[in-house]
């Protein structure tokens, strides 16, 4: 049985509301900011984890500017609206009537406008690059070794099935996840690449999302792996939609 | 499902030794930050010590340094702990716990995910 059953905790997200009041004095676990239950067995949408995150106490950050080439996420804050499911809503706005639409990892896909613009689909983000640069060791870690230890921790940690992980490449000090996963390959009850990759930036971040304060602990043959930046690009199943104004800025 | 399972508790003489097993089923061990906590009768449950997922890193309580040696056998997905030189106050309820996958190892029960049921050892003359 898991801790959750004795303390009443959520081991995949620390940013919950936990009680024994589910059936049979079970312990059920809400989502802070939206009060969504959550599978604790599982990982918590990042729709519900932006919110979660935007209802507690924060301090200011810096944005990065997005590539112009592909979306990346720059960390740029939003309460978002999630649906019943805990998935972002196609369409997001803030306080001031501006909208947007958005992917399926929350990313910002289109030009601003205001409460007349229409986001007909959540278009699907079905490959996400995640470029490492890792901070400097004795020698290059082993290829394979680091191949290995990384599809092992998006399985075991993340939950992510291996089908998912479509590669893994590595240049010193370069390390380069792709993952890949198109609508008709995610099964009912599959982790979505966009959950284990927000997941993943987390713990690289130091800002581990699961429970305890142990935060992640990679290693490749017993040698620690500690990255010193981190880059995340999500492709779309259809093209965004920018302005050419935005493009050539 | 994940089921962890704890052997070896039973009565033993001060000064005695025994030697806890914990087995695991349904995880993949040798990814798992492992831990032994324990339960006095009437008291809270305590840290006694940890190790780290790799193996590389263990702690312990300070009220058993130095008597204990915990340990893992990945190939058999099994965590020990041996435990020499037992006194009165070593008597409690020995649980064995696992953390989520990958992750730091932590003293408080809420930095472990998974619980076996306990096995009882008694140090008494």
């Known amino acids: 049985h898991t801790a959750a059953q004795d303390n009443c905790t959520c081991p995949t997200n620390k940013m919950t509301v936990c009680s024994p009041d589910g059936p049979g004095g079970r312990c059920q676990c809400r989502a802070l900011g939206s009060g969504m239950a959550v599978d604790c067995s599982t990982l918590t949408s990042k729709c519900l984890l932006l919110k979660a995150r935007m209802s507690a106490p924060k301090n200011a950050r810096t944005l990065v500017r997005p590539s112009e080439h592909a979306l990346v996420d720059n960390d740029g804050l939003y309460d978002p609206d999630c649906d019943p499911e805990g998935r972002f809503k196609a369409r997001q706005c803030n306080q001031t009537s501006v909208c947007w639409c958005v992917n399926s990892v929350g990313v910002r896909r289109t030009d601003k406008g205001d409460l007349s613009l229409r986001c007909d689909e959540l278009v699907r983000t079905h490959h996400i690059l995640i470029d490492l640069r890792h901070r400097p060791t004795a020698g290059a870690f082993n290829h394979s070794d680091l191949d290995a230890e990384l599809r092992r921790l998006f399985r075991e940690r993340y939950r992510l099935h291996p089908k998912f992980v479509a590669a893994v490449h590595y240049e010193q000090p370069t390390i380069q996840i792709e993952l890949r996963q198109n609508t008709s390959q995610k099964a009912a009850g599959d982790v979505d690449i966009g959950d284990a990759a927000y997941y993943f930036e987390r713990d690289i971040k130091g800002e581990s999302l699961f429970q305890g304060r142990g935060g992640l602990d990679l290693r490749v043959r017993g040698e620690p792996l500690q990255v010193e930046r981190t880059l995340i690009y999500y492709l779309d199943e259809i093209p965004p939609k920018f302005s050419m104004k935005r493009l050539t800025a | 499902q994940v089921q962890l399972l704890e052997s070896g508790g039973g009565l033993v003489q001060p000064g005695g030794s025994l030697r806890l097993s914990c087995a695991l089923s349904g995880l993949t061990f040798n990814t798992y930050p492992m831990a032994w906590f324990r339960q006095p009768p009437g008291q809270e449950r305590e840290f006694v010590a940890d190790?780290?997922?790799?193996?590389?890193?263990?702690y312990y309580a300070d009220s058993v340094k130095g008597r204990f040696t915990i340990s893992r056998d990945n190939s058999k997905n099994t965590l020990y702990l041996q435990m020499n030189s037992l006194r009165a106050e070593d008597t409690a309820v020995y649980y064995c716990?696992?953390?989520?996958?990958?992750?730091?190892?932590?003293?408080?029960?809420?930095?472990?995910?998974?619980w076996g049921q306990g096995t009882l050892v008694t140090v008494s003359s």
């Open positions: 190790m780290s997922w790799s193996g590389t890193n263990t």
């Open positions: 716990a696992a953390g989520w996958p990958y992750s730091g190892t932590g003293r408080s029960t809420t930095d472990y995910t998974y």
